[in-house]
């Protein structure tokens, strides 16, 4: 016999052809003998199945000698034998009917699991295989289970449903709530403004919720709150800002904010949590604010960065149009008895400049 | 180590007036925001009044408004409630608590001083 | 002022039964709740801030959960030492408000 599979919710055609390109008289009955639909002269008729308002057949291709039936807004429990009687003749298709379902809410926040579940029919034994739209591949009978999700997990996955060497496909789509970046990090020259970027990486029509920016400053012995506020469709309030820093922050989407000055009492990184209305648990994204300072005092030009800069960073001064360079992995650099010039701070990272900044050394006579 | 230490509790007549005071040690005191808590014998937490780093921004609950005055000075690291025409349902221990805690949240508490207002 | 009813106002529970607590709020309130716990004579202690994040130190038995107007805190399996009153707290608008308290008793 046929096996046909078919996806809970959508439409099936189970064909049943006659030898003859002719209209004839034909049945559909299920595995009870329970007569679903027919014809009777030139009519479609329905018998007292559970299927009757669900179930219809083309007629314009009866003369073509084409019975099929179609039954809509497939059920688990449609999953049968159905049976086509045509010409004295009987015809067996199975369906099998499946169902893919998240668990939850399919706007999910990083980091928490997503778990799909395969409805089915008694008796199949079903193997359901998807792929993420970053091309990952997950197997699974019954249930498949995503730990932690990612950002590059939002969009649409692809999962396959196998039974009797058959497939059905099923797209499901998951958006990850996610800030776009995890950490980013701004090089500042003292006094210079700062801007802090945190982008979401998707879009809600309504977007509800609260947060806050905790920053730890490298210099402090503790954490503390830098500004707190409200999000009310996409339209953001401030609710309490620390008076030192005075931050400023944007009405709307991105989420900005603007710090007046950098200043190495500053420096440090941040943590913005996001709370979204209706779902437990917060978006993160890390910020990194990293300050440099070149000073001279007396007979001594110093070159200063503070913030969470990497071993590996190079902090260099050097004078302008000459050789004269002094270069260290380290958070200060400086040099006794400066000549007289354009000197540059730069901080760098394999060559590529993150940070610059002069000072004048006048003569001293 | 963050310490909030309160005292100037006791029993004042109904209609008096009592000075509690929060002693701060362990922190910046000047970059936080403070709070005063209250619990009446036997009775849930009530919270009674906060103010802001530099003093000039203060919030009261309406049962306490125009009779207590949260005040501090930074200088001193200590927080203050001067309290006036006390009732008997004043009666509480009265806790200095940090809101110095994620999410607006009061991350440390003073043990407490008591106040009873009784005749 | 928002009003913030916790239910159950107590509860008998054994070591190792997990309990929850509800909170709901007279309006929204976001993600600005907290929760407290009290011992008989010591000052409140935080649990939770921002209705679900843990606060350091505080064993991850405790979790927060909820948005908007209804919060639950769940105790995993209660420990001896987690014998006490709990309290909800708002920090959305002005005056903050507590809930009335929930007892946890040994039964």
């Known amino acids: 016999k046929k096996v046909v599979l078919g996806k809970k919710g959508d439409t099936v055609e189970l064909t049943c052809n006659a030898s003859q390109k002719k209209n004839t008289q034909f049945h559909w009955k299920n595995s009870n003998q329970i007569k679903i639909l027919g014809i009777q002269g030139l009519f479609l008729t329905k018998g007292p199945s559970k299927l009757s308002d669900r179930a219809d057949s083309r007629k314009s291709l009866w003369d073509q000698g084409c019975f099929s039936m179609i039954i809509k807004n497939l059920k688990i429990e449609d999953s049968d034998t159905y049976i086509c009687e045509v010409e004295n003749k009987k015809e067996e298709v199975e369906l099998l009917v499946f169902g893919l379902t998240a668990n939850s809410d399919t706007h999910l926040l990083e980091g928490q699991s997503l778990t799909l579940t395969l409805e089915s029919p008694p008796g199949s034994s079903p193997s359901v295989k998807c792929r993420s739209p970053g091309g990952k591949n997950i197997q699974g009978g019954r249930t498949i289970s995503v730990p932690q999700l990612e950002r590059q997990d939002s969009g649409t996955w692809t999962c396959t449903v196998s039974q009797d060497q058959k497939t059905v496909e099923f797209k499901i789509d998951i958006v990850v709530l996610a800030f776009q970046k995890a950490s980013s990090t701004v090089y500042k020259k003292e006094g210079e403004q700062v801007e802090f970027s945190f982008p979401l990486a998707f879009t809600l029509e309504k977007l509800t919720g609260s947060g806050e920016l905790w920053w730890q400053a490298e210099r402090a012995s503790s954490s503390k709150s830098w500004i707190t506020f409200d999000l009310k469709n996409k339209e953001v309030s401030v609710k309490r800002v620390t008076q030192d820093p005075k931050l400023q922050m944007g009405k709307k989407l991105p989420l900005h904010l603007t710090l007046p000055q950098a200043l190495p009492q500053y420096a440090g990184s941040g943590n913005l949590t996001l709370a979204l209305e209706a779902k437990t648990g917060k978006l993160h994204q890390e910020v990194n604010l990293v300050v440099m300072r070149a000073t001279q005092f007396q007979e001594n030009l110093t070159c200063e960065v503070w913030g969470p800069t990497s071993p590996k960073l190079t902090l260099s001064l050097k004078l302008e149009n000459k050789g004269a360079t002094v270069s260290k992995q380290a958070k200060a650099v400086w040099v006794l008895n400066p000549e007289a010039g354009m000197w540059q701070c730069l901080l760098s990272d394999s060559g590529q400049v993150l940070l610059e900044s002069n000072i004048k050394v006048v003569p001293t006579w | 180590e963050v310490q909030l230490v309160e005292s100037g509790g006791g029993l004042v007549q109904p209609g008096g007036s009592l000075r509690l005071s929060c002693a701060a040690s362990g922190f910046t005191f000047s970059s936080y925001w403070m709070s005063w808590v209250r619990q009446a014998p036997g009775k849930g937490l009530e919270w009674v009044a906060n103010i802001n780093e530099d003093g000039n921004e203060k919030y009261y609950v309406d049962s306490v408004k125009g009779r207590l005055t949260i005040s501090r000075d930074n200088a001193k690291n200590s927080l203050y409630l001067q309290m006036n025409s006390l009732r008997a349902e004043d009666t509480a221990v009265y806790f200095c608590?940090?809101?110095?805690?994620?999410?607006?949240?009061?991350?440390?508490w003073g043990q407490g001083a008591l106040v009873t207002v009784s005749s | 002022d928002i009003q913030m009813t916790q239910s159950p106002s107590s509860v008998s529970a054994s070591v190792g039964d997990r309990v929850s607590i509800t909170c709901r709020a007279s309006q929204g309130i976001s993600s600005w709740l907290a929760w407290y716990q009290q011992k008989p004579g010591k000052a409140p202690k935080i649990l939770i801030y921002g209705a679900s994040s843990l606060q350091s130190g505080v064993p991850s038995r405790f979790s927060g959960s909820g948005s908007g107007t209804d919060f639950t805190l769940t105790i995993s399996s209660l420990q001896p030492e987690d014998f006490a009153t709990y309290y909800c707290q708002q920090a959305n608008s002005f005056p903050w408000t507590f809930g009335q308290g929930t007892k946890v008793e040994i039964k």
């Open positions: 608590a940090r809101e110095g805690g994620q999410w607006l949240s009061l991350d440390y």
